[in-house]
């Protein structure tokens, strides 16, 4: 039975040209995390595998940095980066957990983080 929950940074905003850290955290389970996939809508951004380490998709290599931890740092943000991001935790023996983050990239300098929230 899957007992874990994914906590994410929730709805966040950031300034155009700046950077942002996408973070998810799996809790309430003793399952082993074997891999975390990061996706932007229908694009694979990066993968962190327990054995193989990080793989960043070549088309995002200039603007995506691994970490901190299992998170992902997006750099040189553009308005086109606005949208949904997903962290997909592959675990054993539980299976797959998915967290969602919505990022809004703002033209103005007023960009505040949203509240943290949990996805069961």
């Amino acid at each position: 039975m899957m007992t874990g929950t994914i906590e994410t940074t929730g709805n966040i905003s950031a300034e155009k040209g700046g950077s942002i850290i996408l973070q998810c955290h799996l809790s309430s389970t003793t399952a082993q995390v074997t891999q975390v996939n990061w996706e932007q809508q229908d694009q694979l951004l990066a993968i962190c595998n327990a054995d193989l380490g990080w793989h960043i998709s070549p088309s995002f290599k200039d603007r995506v940095a691994p970490g901190p931890g299992l998170g992902l740092t997006l750099q040189s943000l553009t308005v086109n980066d606005t949208g949904e991001y997903f962290c997909i935790y592959h675990t054993y023996p539980d299976g797959t957990y998915t967290g969602r983050i919505f990022l809004e990239v703002l033209e103005s300098s007023v960009a505040e983080h949203g509240a943290r929230f949990q996805i069961p």
């Epitope: 229908d42 193989l52 592959h90």
Partner: antibody
């Protein structure tokens, strides 16, 4: 240099058994998921089975479930496919392939031919 | 299971031609789509992974695009060594499934 070398194919009667092996070299075998993919004569590619790096998870195509068993010995850098209750439709070239990140198959062996016929 | 439909099943082209092969998934597979080249009597060779990433050592005339359900493999200028059969494959979920293949023949 990454190398995958299959062996164990041959002619077997329907209902018989075979064990295929895939010897891996040139990479840290224990870090990678591994797969078996087959190709019937003149046909396309069909995924058969896969196994995670630590053997924690194994997956099978419906067509072989209950008859084939995938396994690995990380100390010997070897992947196996035990094939039981073989049928004529199992006749194919069997390839082993490396599956980094469980997303793509980047290196393939040369294949070993299994022929099931009476 | 996710069905992968490739088209065309075969095509004839000349050296220097631009060739496009399409692959459609029966449900959204994000960008978990790979392309392979296979020559007679040989093992498949990975060309493109994760829809658009060029595998190391593969010539830049090969490119991939698409996401969701519709994907394309393009060879910008066909070379003599490119005459082969091409397969798409989804890795979104098990069972992994392949398209039926596209045979690229000399016109």
């Amino acid at each position: 240099e990454v190398q995958l070398l299959e062996s164990g194919g041959g002619l077997v009667q329907p209902g018989g058994s075979l064990r295929l092996s895939c010897a891996a070299s040139g990479f840290t075998f224990s870090s990678y998921s591994m797969h078996w993919v087959r190709q019937a004569p003149g046909k396309g590619l069909e995924w058969v089975a896969s196994i995670k790096s630590s053997s924690s998870n194994k997956y099978y195509a419906d067509s072989v479930k209950g008859r084939f068993t995938i396994s690995r010995d990380n100390s010997k850098n070897t992947l196996y496919l035990q094939m039981n209750s073989l049928r004529a439709e199992d006749t194919a070239v069997y390839y082993c392939a490396r599956g980094p990140y469980d997303v793509w198959l980047d290196y393939w062996g040369q294949g070993t031919l299994v022929t099931v016929s009476s | 299971d996710i069905q992968m439909t490739q088209s065309p099943s075969s095509l004839s082209a000349s050296v220097g031609d631009r060739v496009t092969i399409t692959c459609r998934a029966s449900q959204s597979i994000s960008s978990y789509l790979n392309w392979y080249q296979q020559k007679p009597g040989k093992a498949p060779k990975l060309l493109i992974y994760a829809a658009s990433s060029l595998q190391s050592g593969v010539p830049s005339r090969f490119s991939g695009s698409g996401s969701g359900t519709d994907f394309t493999l393009t060879i910008s200028s066909l070379q003599p060594e490119d005459f082969a059969t091409y397969y798409c494959q989804q890795s979104y979920s098990t069972p992994l499934t392949f398209g039926g293949g596209t045979k690229v023949e000399i016109k």
